[in-house]
Structure formats: C-alpha cells, structure tokens
C-alpha cells in the first residue's frame, strides 16, 4: 500500500488529490483523509475531507487498485495558505500511511504556488488568469 499527493488546476479551481494504491483485499476498513496544518494529529476527525475505500472495486480482474480523494478549492485565497498532508488509516489492521507534506503559498500579487509535491508536480499558478505559469 502506498499514498501519493498531487494537484491539478481547472480554471480558478485547485484540486488537491490523495491517491492510495492498494490490493483489493486491503481496502476494507481503510480511510483516506487530507489534513491542513496538522503536523502531529492528522486524523479523519480533524481532516478537511475523508474517503472510505470501497470494500469491492466492482470487478474481479484487478490486481492493484487506485482510490482517489479529491478536495476542491473553488478559488484560492490567503486562507488556503498552509501545509497539507494526505494520510490513510486501516481500522482493521491498524496500518497508518502518511504522505509527504506539501504547501500552498499565496503571494501578494494574487498568485499562488503549490510546493513539496514530486518534482513534476511542483506547480505555480497565476491566480487571476487561472493558468499554469
């Protein structure tokens, strides 16, 4: 099981995405969640959003499955600046996964950057124009 973080932009919207890769039989009791500014106590209860993994992917001819939690910010503001983390927890086995911290930095010019993702996922956004700069 592993967890990755990513981001994508659609117009003025910013999507923060937590992706968990797991085997079919590992899904039961697993919760994926996204926290903001929670360095030590990130939990489903303190999260911005949580997703309970499907106990059944719907088909049987699958090995590893990817499940995605998507948190959408319709318009990034200074309030969204901070440190984010994707996490996952199994209520069945007690396994806990913690993704890398990543940050949203809102600049005085009205733009924002997302840092701390994989190199190819280091994003800089022009907030006003809604484009990748």
């Amino acid at each position: 099981i592993n967890i990755t973080s990513s981001a994508s932009q659609e117009g003025t919207r910013l999507n923060l995405i937590c992706t968990v890769w797991h085997k079919k039989e590992e899904a039961e009791g697993f919760v994926v969640f996204l926290c903001k500014d929670r360095s030590g106590d990130c939990s489903p209860e303190t999260s911005l959003k949580q997703l309970r993994l499907k106990r059944d992917p719907g088909i049987d001819g699958v090995g590893e499955i990817s499940s995605q939690l998507m948190f959408t910010i319709s318009q990034v503001t200074p309030l969204h600046s901070g440190t984010y983390q994707c996490c996952a927890r199994s209520q069945k086995s007690g396994i806990r996964l913690q993704g890398h911290f990543f940050s949203i930095l809102f600049t005085e010019t009205g733009n924002y950057t997302v840092t701390g993702l994989k190199q190819r996922q280091h994003l800089e956004f022009s907030h006003n124009e809604g484009t990748l700069s």
Epitope: L51, R52, K54, R55, D56, G58, I59, D60, G61
Partner: antibody, heavy 116, light 107 residues
C-alpha cells in the same frame, strides 16, 4: 433477511423519462455495488450499469450512456435508475441486483411499457 | 467488451438426465464467471459463483468448472424445477456482460 423491493409497473409515452426505484433492506446498503439489468420479453439479460452507494461511483455499458442515469439515496437505502427519451425498445423488465461476487440477490423486476 | 457465447442455445432433455452447458469467453477471465437460472416470469437466481463455488441453498446436483475462456455448468440428474433459462456472467472487467443464454426444455 436481505430484500430488494422494486417499484411497480410503469406505462410511459415515447420521449418521456421515468425513474424506477429499488429499496434495499437486510444489509449495509452503502458497501455493495447495486447492478441494473434489462430484459426484453423473450430475450436474454443485458447489463446496464452499477452504482456504489457509499460514494456514488457509477459505471455504465456504452449503449446505456446518455440513456440511463443511476443514483442512490443512502438515507433511504434506495437505488434509482432514470431512463430518458424513451422509445419502444426501452420496453422491458428492469432488475436491480446486489453484487457479492456474482449477483446474489435480485429485485422482483419492474416492467416498463413505452407506448403512445 | 468481453463476449460470452453460450451453447447450445436450446437443450431438450428428460428428467433424471445429466447435462452440461457451455459458456465461452472472448478473452481470458480467470475464474470470474457466474451462472444463473431463470424460470419464466421470475428473477434470475445465482447458482454458481467464480466458476466452481457453490451457493448456499442451491442443490448439490449443480456444479461448475472451467477457467480462462471455457466454462461448464453441469446438472447431475435434472429435475422438473430445473427447466428454464441458464445464463453465464463475467465480472472480470467493466462492463459486466452476460451470455445469450441456454434454454433447458423438457423433451
């Protein structure tokens, strides 16, 4: 005991839309895929699509994209199929079924008749 | 989409005969194949799951075998209540698909 109770027979005009229901009881509705299957008189079974009530994820066979819309209401443990722009070929029995590997529990079916 | 071909389309038998119904997949589906029986004006009923696994409440005269692309449903000593339509179904990949069916009728 597990039951899937479907809504009663429907007569609809061509071009209209209908919404059929399937109320589940006796199990945790949100953690099993609900399937919808079409059967025309004297014909075989045709898989329309499925919905996972826990998160609303739905899948369709290509033929029914744009024709069928699957939804689920967690509060009432009810799955729905909406069929739009009805034509005579939509006349059939529509079944809901729960997936546990195979489709282990089936509703009694709803007969839809499209006629002017 | 995976196509399931059932044969024969119709099978005429006498009660107490033993029969085999075939289902062939257009590509390998491992053991992700299920069998259903449907009587006229009734809902289908699951007989066998995952090619060979029995279902609680289904008589032991029903058995399934096969893997990959070729599957068989066997009925050991057919009873009158067994007549009707038999369908196979694959759950290996989206979209789920059904075979065209085999009609088991009284000779």
């Amino acid at each position: 005991q597990i039951q899937l109770q479907q809504s009663g027979a429907v007569l609809a005009r061509p071009g209209a839309s209908v919404k059929l229901s399937c109320k589940a009881s006796g199990y945790t509705f949100t953690t099993y895929w609900m399937q919808w299957v079409k059967q025309r008189p004297g014909q075989g079974l045709e898989w329309i699509g499925a919905i996972y009530p826990g998160d609303g994820d739905s899948r369709y066979t290509q033929k029914f994209k744009g024709k069928a819309t699957l939804t689920a209401d967690k509060s009432s443990s009810t799955a729905y199929i909406q069929l739009s722009n009805l034509v005579s070929e939509d006349s059939a029995v529509y079944y809901c079924a729960r997936r546990l590997g195979g489709f282990d529990y089936w509703g009694q079916g709803t007969t839809l008749t499209v006629s002017s | 989409d995976i196509v399931l071909t059932q044969s024969p389309p119709t099978l005429s038998v006498t009660p107490r005969d033993s029969v085999s119904l075939s289902c062939r997949a257009s590509q390998s589906i491992s053991n992700n194949l299920h069998w259903y029986h449907q009587k006229s004006h009734e809902s289908p009923r699951l007989l066998i799951k995952y090619a060979s696994q029995s279902i609680s409440g289904i008589p032991s005269r029903f058995s399934g075998s096969g893997s990959g692309t070729d599957f068989t449903l066997s009925i050991n000593s057919v009873e009158t209540e067994d007549f009707g339509m038999y369908f196979c179904h694959q759950s290996n990949s989206w979209p789920h698909t059904f075979g065209g069916g085999t009609k088991l009728e009284i000779k």
